[in-house]
């Protein structure tokens, strides 16, 4: 069965300087491959977070993603700025075989509105 990626919130509002959580769950970890968060779509989309061990300032995972059966890939963005506004997508990839990973499923997106403090 095809993996499903769920982002339950269509939008969230956060005051500048505060933190916000963007929720994402998947129905399966198979086929093996990373899960990444992006802001925007198409060629100009920006990688926001990858669950592959790298460090991303101001962003961290919410659940313990080292659990081998973890299906929760929500993230917390700290010290939000107006530049963080936009639509965020949680994307499941299938690992590539000596080529780039292949995107197989994306969540519906969560729009982040940043309110002036």
């Amino acid at each position: 069965t095809e993996v499903k990626v769920t982002q339950p919130e269509k939008s969230v509002s956060v005051a500048a300087g505060d933190s916000t959580i963007l929720n994402c769950t998947v129905t399966s970890l198979l086929p093996v491959g990373p899960i990444r968060w992006y802001r925007g779509v198409g060629q100009s989309r920006l990688l926001i977070y990858s669950f592959t061990g790298e460090h991303f300032p101001r962003i961290r995972n919410v659940s313990d993603t080292t659990k081998r059966n973890n299906m929760d890939f929500s993230i917390r963005i700290s010290n939000v700025t107006p530049e963080d506004a936009g639509t965020y997508y949680c994307v499941k990839f299938q690992r590539g075989s000596s080529e780039p990973d292949t995107e197989i499923q994306s969540g519906g997106g969560t729009e982040v509105y940043v309110l002036a403090k």
């Epitope: 093996v32 313990d64 081998r68």
Partner: antibody, heavy 118, light 108 residues
Amino acid sequence: DVQLVESGGGVVRPGESLRLSCAASGFTFSSNAMSWVRQAPGKGLEWLAGISAGGSDTYYPASVKGRFTISRDNSKNTLYLQMNTLTAEDTAVYYCARETWNHLFDYWGLGTLVTVSS
Amino acid sequence: SYELTQPPSVSVSPGQTARITCSGGDYYSTYYAWYQQKPGQAPVTVIHSDDKRPSDIPERFSGSSSGTTVTLTISGVQAEDEADYYCGGYDGRTYINTFGGGTKLTVL
């Protein structure tokens, strides 16, 4: 630099128990899953147990499940392996290893030798 | 569970290319790594996540995959590369780690 130092090995008699320790430094221990791997003399590598970063989830192959227990104390940056009802077949060098994001291993300790002999 | 199969031995002359294969995993659910072990020493990870090389590992080590077979390639083999090489796998379906039986690389 990442450093993993095992201790607690030694000579024990069949049927006895032993607890191994692995002291970790040079990285954020509480953020990484960990595993134990052993190698019998002249043999290959055998995975024994894995544990999530928070310590709530543990994983074992059928060969040692119920007899070996992995645990960790994140406040002490230490990983443990409790081994019960040891037999001669458990004689091996025991390594602790740090897991990558996808549960392979990137850093290994130097190992501690366990000898089970009457 | 699954078994990973490696050739027991591979021989190569210095400066040549050595290829060590590992088969038996399910590409849909398995990640692979390669571990080098010299006599009396602990294993060292030379490749993880199929083809990722740790920063302190020479560029002559590379990993690739094709179907259910993964390959460790050592280009321009040096005498210091003589060691046992273990293929390792993590199966996301069963949550189990497995090792191949190991391949002894001899540099002639």
